[in-house]
């Protein structure tokens, strides 16, 4: 039982939450809160929006983003792409891991121009020590942040 | 290997399913089936809609709700909020953990009467012994129950 | 720590990815890539679209499917059902585990006839040795495959 408890206490896990600073508008990945409120890191590191593996293995990684808008203006992307991507020294480009495409703007009704939608991703991927996972949303202008409960990013070793 | 098997058998986990009694209309959280069919509790307790931690640690908690309706009349909620909330003796109010807002009524097309939508939430949170997690949906009238496979609530320690 | 590492290395887990051969049109379950790219099997087997348990216990199973289309043609189902189903020697028919119904066609807007939607399912179920889990989508003609990142199927023991 001591062994079992130790196993859980050491098992890499993290839950990062959305914050006002999450959306940079720079074309980079979303940034996250790592310490305040519900956010934590246990056996994983964080760097510029990325969860960084300290231990090689299979991880269940997940992210949710809250989307919202008013109406469906023509200049706004009709398709939203929300994805988890891996950065590794072995490749020069980010590698797509888990991706969703949605057309949330179609949520607006004749009765209400305000629409809300949510995108959830989760799946098991292999990470080597030092490999990183980031979240990207295109168009990130439609991501709605509030208090860290609606948009988040996490992982745990399986 | 004996140790590994024991570890899994003792790892807290639960999966609760939607039932006819889930929707109370009282403003309280959704209630759940804990024993029949696919539902089970292992190392977690249940009380009035809440999963209760018996062991402190990080848990991946999740919930899915099936939403559905006929048409999109003005009097019906245009925004649905589906959330997981923590109850703890340390605070008088429930604490939002994971929340989604959706505008499912926009799923109905100009011709199509019946619309369906689904909301999934999952993430890692810390629970102390005795702390509780509940599911709330506003407006719960749009939750569609059938056989426990479409609306559910679960957790496991990570 | 040696024990802890061994535990993780032996913990059953899998992530299967969508491929061009996933959609058979035969009325059977979706088929999956098990080795290439992000796909892997560890302590679980695969057979004709099914993840097969080698070890009895509780598993978190999940699937995501990417849906997409152009407009809402009359001949197409207005409701999509995405589900995870169990096959067991103890019953002649598949057992529904986790199911979602969505009306994605309502995503098409006045500005854009192309629509995208995503359905995610995840939950904990018990599997005996030899029991199988498959993914079904009705109408599977709306599933959009690309590179294994948008539609996938996985599991790990909890």
């Amino acid at each position: 039982l001591i062994q079992e408890r130790r196993s859980h206490q050491n098992n890499p896990a993290a839950h990062l939450t959305g914050a006002n600073s999450s959306l940079t508008g720079s074309g980079g990945p979303l940034l996250w809160e790592t310490q305040l409120g519900l956010a934590f890191l246990r056996g994983l590191d964080y760097h510029d929006g990325a969860l960084v593996a300290n231990k090689a293995g299979y991880y269940y990684i997940y992210s949710k983003v809250q989307l919202g808008g008013v109406g469906c203006p023509l200049g706004l992307a009709s398709t939203i792409t929300h994805g988890l991507y891996k950065r590794t020294p072995r490749y020069p480009e980010e590698l797509e891991l888990l991706v969703s495409q949605q057309s949330p703007c179609g949520r607006a009704t004749s009765n209400s121009r305000v629409w809300w939608d949510s995108s959830f991703l989760g799946g098991v991927v292999h990470l080597e020590v030092g490999e990183e996972v980031v979240v990207r949303v295109l168009d990130e202008r439609l991501v709605r942040l509030r208090d860290g409960t609606r948009s988040y990013f996490g992982a745990f070793m399986v | 290997l004996i140790q590994e098997r024991r570890s899994h058998q003792n790892n807290p986990a639960a999966h609760l399913t939607g039932a006819n009694s889930s929707l109370t209309g009282s403003g309280g959280p959704l209630l759940w089936e804990t024993q029949l069919g696919l539902a089970f509790l292992r190392g977690l307790d249940y009380h009035d809609g809440a999963l209760v931690a018996n062991k402190a640690g990080y848990y991946y908690i999740y919930s899915k709700v099936q939403l559905g309706g006929v048409g999109c009349p003005l009097g019906l909620a245009s925004t649905i909020t589906h959330g997981l909330y923590k109850r703890t003796p340390r605070y008088p109010e429930e604490l939002e953990l994971l929340v989604s807002q959706q505008s499912p009524c926009g799923r109905a097309t100009s011709n199509s009467r019946v619309w369906w939508d689904s909301s999934f939430l999952g993430g890692v949170v810390h629970l102390e012994v005795g702390e509780e997690v509940v599911v709330r949906v506003l407006d719960e009238r749009l939750v569609r129950l059938r056989d426990g496979t479409r609306s559910y609530f679960g957790a496991f320690m990570v | 720590l040696i024990q802890e590492r061994r535990s993780h290395q032996n913990n059953p887990a899998a992530h299967l990815t969508g491929a061009n051969s996933s959609l058979t049109g035969s009325g059977g379950p979706l088929l999956w890539e098990t080795q290439l790219g992000l796909a892997f099997l560890r302590g679980l087997d695969y057979h004709d679209g099914a993840l097969v348990a080698n070890k009895a216990g509780y598993y978190y199973i999940y699937s995501k499917v990417q849906l997409g289309g152009v407009g809402c043609p009359l001949g197409l189902a207005s409701t999509i059902t995405h589900g995870l189903y169990k096959r067991t020697p103890r019953y002649p028919e598949e057992l529904e585990l986790l199911v979602s119904q969505q009306s994605p066609c309502g995503r098409a807007t006045s500005n854009s006839r192309v629509w995208w939607d995503s359905s995610f399912l995840g939950g904990v179920v018990h599997l005996e040795v030899g029991e199988e889990v498959v993914v079904r989508v009705l109408d599977e003609r709306l599933v959009r495959l690309r590179d294994g990142t948008r539609s996938y199927f996985g599991a790990f023991m909890v």
Partner: antibody, heavy 122, light 107 residues
Framework: QVQLQESGPGLVKPSGTLSLTCAVS?????????WNWVRQPPGKGLEWIGE???????NCNPSLKSRVTISVDKSKNQFSLKMNSVTAADTAVYYC???????????????WGQGTTVTVSS | DIQMTQSPSSLSASVGDRVSITCQAS??????LNWYQQKPGKAPKLLIY???NLETGVPSRFSGSGSGTDFTFTISSLQPEDIATYYC?????????FGGGTKVEIK
Amino acid sequence: QVQLQESGPGLVKPSGTLSLTCAVSGGSISSTHWWNWVRQPPGKGLEWIGEIYHSGSTNCNPSLKSRVTISVDKSKNQFSLKMNSVTAADTAVYYCTRGGAAAGTNYGLDVWGQGTTVTVSS
Amino acid sequence: DIQMTQSPSSLSASVGDRVSITCQASQDISNYLNWYQQKPGKAPKLLIYDASNLETGVPSRFSGSGSGTDFTFTISSLQPEDIATYYCQQYDNLPLTFGGGTKVEIK
């Protein structure tokens, strides 16, 4: 249980306006149900006219839409049908009926009035 | 509009017979189909909703099946009180549309 009762003139002149009211008793019109009008010409089948929700949201059969107005009066717990420019082809038994709930996913017309016969003739 | 084609338009059967009526939709309507019974001079009565679910209080000799475009309504053992016209109705799309009806008579 909920009961419906249609009322209105049984005879309308061609090019005139047909006006019918449906009184809801045993329940509130402000429930999440849709409230419908259906008609049946003599010796023929059923034709859906339209529906209304207590908030005033309506849907009408496109074949009749330009001539039909459906309204609701929550204070009187009733809803009404007006059809203008009527012709002999509008002669029928008119039924009011309760449809499925907006917060539901089946749409059976489960409660019907007894029907009222409207004849269009000069 | 979705066209609902009912057949036969009329039938005659003996008491105790099994009677079946079919309804075909012009496009896929999933299971969004209802069946009604209308007796002479009366309002229609809902018997079956969602293609196969029996409305409360309706005798179990009535049943429905089908999905997509093809649906069947069955009376397992025809009774004298079942003399009526039966209608199918779809609610997948607006406008709601009914089949032309099937008149059931006793031989």
